[in-house]
């Protein structure tokens, strides 16, 4: 059965938008007006995952691209990457764990915790134009809260 997906954009709690930075990286920066068209549109897929009260397992693909955010160990550190997949097989209900994020939503603020690496979150820096990364701290300098905006399919 096909997995259910919705198209959306994400902005961090400082209202920075996410854009492509090279073929396999996202960065966060403030955009206005026409430049808003540069922001990445995600296809958020509702996938299978661990049962938990307040966590909804999702996968975050780039709309109409065969790229998914995934979490892997690089030099022994949990790392966020954009991974290329076979579009014939993705998205699917049972995504590999590295593609799964636990969406935690409180008062329309979203956090995305790695299913593969608990307590590691999709994060942005306070600084402008820096890469989106996987961070192991919440409530510190780095930003882990996002808002979501729906995009017409």
């Amino acid at each position: 059965a096909p997995v259910r997906s919705l198209n959306c954009t994400l902005r961090d709690s400082q209202q920075k938008s996410l854009v492509m930075s090279g073929p396999y990286e996202l960065k966060a920066l403030h955009l206005q007006g026409q430049d808003m068209e540069q922001q990445v549109v995600f296809s958020m897929s509702f996938v299978q995952g661990e049962e938990s009260n307040d966590k909804i397992p999702v996968a975050l693909g780039l709309k109409e691209k065969n790229l998914y955010l995934s979490c892997v160990l690089k030099d022994d550190k949990p790392t966020l990457q954009l991974e290329s997949v076979d579009p014939k097989n993705y998205p699917k209900k049972k995504m590999e764990k590295r593609f799964v994020f636990n969406k935690i939503e409180i008062n329309n603020k979203l956090e995305f915790e790695s299913a593969q690496f608990p307590n590691w979150y999709i994060s942005t820096s306070q600084a402008e134009n820096m890469p989106v990364f996987l961070g192991g701290t919440k409530g510190g300098q780095d930003i882990t809260d996002f808002t979501m905006q729906f995009v017409s399919s």
Partner: antibody, heavy 120, light 107 residues
Framework: QVQLVQSGAEVKKPGSSVKVSCKAS????????IEWVRQAPGQGLEWMGE????????NYNEKFKGRVTITADKSTSTAYMELSSLRSEDTAVYYC?????????????WGQGTLVTVSS | DIQMTQSPSSLSASVGDRVTITCKFS??????LSWFQQKPGKAPKSLIY???RLVDGVPSRFSGSGSGTDFTLTISSLQPEDFATYYC?????????FGGGTKVEIK
Amino acid sequence: QVQLVQSGAEVKKPGSSVKVSCKASGYTFDRYWIEWVRQAPGQGLEWMGEILPGSGDINYNEKFKGRVTITADKSTSTAYMELSSLRSEDTAVYYCARMYYDYDQGFDYWGQGTLVTVSS
Amino acid sequence: DIQMTQSPSSLSASVGDRVTITCKFSQDIDRFLSWFQQKPGKAPKSLIYRVKRLVDGVPSRFSGSGSGTDFTLTISSLQPEDFATYYCVQYDEFPYTFGGGTKVEIK
């Protein structure tokens, strides 16, 4: 508080159309699917389709495809379900319900229902 | 389409009885299963979502369990206001489908 208020009962002739409305209040209309479900007299519940007003995404039950049209007006927080080519077996109570965009909480609030009677 | 069977279609029970209603599906439906209560002439009322989560305000005598293809609604001690028809629904896959209902009547 959350409310889904539906339009009043309708009597329709076979072959005609009916449009039922569902006005939402007490929550962010954009972020919840509006579901349409019907119940024929003395029968069970049957899902017809859904719309997510924030994105415009719509999903229909194939059984009704071509006969049902679901729309939403964000400015008035109102969803609509139009069923065409009515026949006597479409006589039913039509309900709207809401479901969060991520499907987490299921059909958590329901409208009061709209009785549609199809009779010549 | 996912095929489903809700059983029993009706049952007679007394106040204080433990009541169990089951829904069986033709394939795994992950976590997207809810239970409703409906009284004559009224809209359905949500009791349980995501298999086992109790809706706010619903008494703790109601509980849900199960996984894969088999799911259960249990009323631990039936109260007078619980006499009604109960439905399960799967919203894992289109078209969403409701069970045929279980009418709980007074013995």
